[in-house]
Interface confidence: low
Amino acid sequence: NQDLPVIKCVLINHKNNDSSVGKSSSYPMVSESPEDLGCALRPQSSGTVYEAAAVEVDVSASITLQVLVDAPGNISCLWVFKHSSLNCQPHFDLQNRGVVSMVILKMTETQAGEYLLFIQSEATNYTILFTVSIRNTLLYTLRRPYFRKMENQDALVCISESVPEPIVEWVLCDSQGESCKEESPAVVKKEEKVLHELFGTDIRCCARNELGRECTRLFTIDLNQTPQTTLPQLFLKVGEPLWIRCKAVHVNHGFGLTWELENKALEEGNYFEMSTYSTNRTMIRILFAFVSSVARNDTGYYTCSSSKHPSQSALVTIVEKGFINATNSSEDYEIDQYEEFCFSVRFKAYPQIRCTWTFSRKSFPCEQKGLDNGYSISKFCNHKHQPGEYIFHAENDDAQFTKMFTLNIRRKPQVLAEASASQASCFSDGYPLPSWTWKKCSDKSPNCTEEITEGVWNRKANRKVFGQWVSSSTLNMSEAIKGFLVKCCAYNSLGTSCETILLNSPGPFPFIQDNIS
């Protein structure tokens, strides 16, 4: 139809800095670059209806839906959302195109739905339909990447079945040990799905999307490295692909590599070899063992042998379900006020765990490190010497694990006192939990040496503050002590603290603190 206007629909995402509801506007805010929403004529609809591509918005994001109309003469417009009409003010840009905008600030569920824009120009009437929905992150997944061999090529493909589709990158390192940490200069990252350079020391593939980042390391046996004291172990679940790389370097090409499973050579099609000369003219060979989908009978000792190197093996264990193995009994620690100390949990898990450390309802990031014996360890050192209960929580696709720790800080008691008409109470949070004495100060005992034993009630650890125990002692008022100064003292192996209380009448009491080490 020659009379139809040329229209363009765009989405503008804004950096959030406002907090009102959706409004029709002729003043778009400062924003990121507009995204073309297509706006195609909708088939099988009565009248002229353009439909923009569906718009997905994060909760609390701010956007502008904008229509640019290339039609002669004036235009008038009306927005309709959920059967309500919204004011519409078109304006004209420098190219004399009509511009109509709808600003939605701080997106909420109530602002999701169909936005209809009715435009009337001198030539024709038409409708533009925008569908705005809130991005449903509950449907998002992030799965650990796995490897596949490229057909007819010596290359590996990295695949992560995640939603939204993740960015896949290879993380390569040619050094040993600590220098292969993620941000080390020895680490090279390649944002590619396919990797041809398979001779490196350490090869990992990582996938990242809105949910985070998951990595898989290419399991490697290096025949030129001294074997670990314990046999390396690789866990896989039934149906997952198995990949083991055997690597060896020799002065010349006169050597070969072979894979065996439980002393039987691997079948053809379950391995492939690559070789190259290194810069110093030595020959590097790598031999991959792979099974596209493992079954229980693929469990066993995989041995890589060379005609010029000692053999090395790895134990591959195929499990039906993932697991987390660790002792979950709670552990109590007592340390000095300035002593360096870290909580640590040693565990064996497959697939890799996600974990957190928690203290007083606050979560802390959790780092894990692989040990040579197939175990991993997570340490937490950021306790800032705060006594209390610390929780380590770990989970993977199939298992959950929680372990409790109590941290006690050895210190001299600090005493707080309070009194009422009928009793006086003292509290202390020192550790080890203190013992209490009450003393009466009188003419006969100006140094307060006369011990009170009657009417004293000690409660150990009666109040738990985030796992921190508090001890208290209460003295019931009797005629014998009314009007006298009394002293409560808390003592443990690190010292003594006292507080003096005047037992006269109810009301604010003067307290005199005494610190005796």
Epitope: R143, R148, V157, E161, P164, K193, V194, G239
Partner: antibody, heavy 120, light 107 residues
Framework: QVQLVQSGAEVKKPGASVKVSCKAS????????MHWVRQAPGQGLEWMGW????????GYAQRFQGRVTMTRDTSTSTVYMELSSLRSEDTAVYYC?????????????WGQGTTVTVSS | DIQMTQSPSSLSASVGDRVTITCQAS??????LNWYQQKPGKAPKLLIY???ILQSGVPSRFSGSGSGTDFTLTISSLQPEDFATYYC?????????FGQGTKLEIK
């Protein structure tokens, strides 16, 4: 040879659901992703989602999220695509398509297509 | 979502002609672009994947090139069976999107 055979044409009322099947033969069913693509009359191709027949994992285009479900039966090498809350705009030919061994290298084998008509 | 824009939307040519169809992506898609041919009433057929690799069984008169955002499908010498609609498709990130199609007709 590698083949994908789809179920026959369907006529549905708005609001109803349709379940289209796609039977694979001539290759290892669990080694290749399966995609679903639709084509409205006189229109272009629109990708709906993927399924990994080995794991059962799926990924759907956002515009079909909540309305589409892809399942598989490995014993019969069949994948299914169910679309619910049908509307007239869902009238289209629905194709299943086998992925190249590397899912990002396109769809190398297609079913013959299943025509779904949504009309009151 | 990544938008794919094909041009031209239709094209008239004669047997023996050299024909070029272009496809532009709204974002960098590296080399993850595929080309399909579709004849009326039939399912699409994969011609080229990874921007330039010819699918087995496809005649060598078809070729593809490009990387990043700009891609080209070339038919070096049109044959009668080549008159059809051609679609480009990105497989860089989901949702995988197709171009709107280029209809190649006999002049």
């Amino acid at each position: 040879q590698v083949q994908l055979v789809q179920s026959g044409a369907e006529v549905k009322k708005p609001g109803a659901s349709v379940k289209v099947s796609c039977k694979a033969s001539g290759y290892t069913f669990t080694n290749y992703y399966m995609h679903w693509v639709r084509q409205a009359p006189g229109q272009g191709l629109e990708w709906m989602g993927w399924m990994n027949p080995n794991s059962g994992n799926t990924g759907y285009a956002q515009r079909f999220q909540g309305r589409v479900t892809m399942t598989r039966d490995t014993s019969t090498s069949t994948v299914y695509m169910e679309l619910s809350s049908l509307r007239s705009e869902d009238t289209a030919v629905y194709y299943c398509a086998k992925s190249h061994y590397y899912y990002f290298y396109g769809m190398d084998v297609w079913g013959q297509g299943t025509t779904v008509t949504v009309s009151s | 979502d990544i938008q794919m824009t094909q041009s031209p939307s239709s094209l008239s040519a004669s047997v023996g002609d050299r024909v070029t169809i272009t496809c532009q992506a709204s974002h960098d898609i590296s080399k993850y672009l595929n080309w399909y041919q579709q004849k009326p009433g039939k399912a699409p057929k994969l011609l080229i994947y990874a921007a330039s690799i010819l699918q087995s069984g496809v005649p060598s008169r078809f070729s593809g090139s490009g990387s990043g955002t700009d891609f080209t499908l070339t038919i070096s010498s049109l044959q009668p069976e080549d008159f059809a609609t051609y679609y480009c498709q990105q497989s860089y990130s989901t949702p995988y999107t197709f171009g709107q199609g280029t209809k190649l007709e006999i002049k």
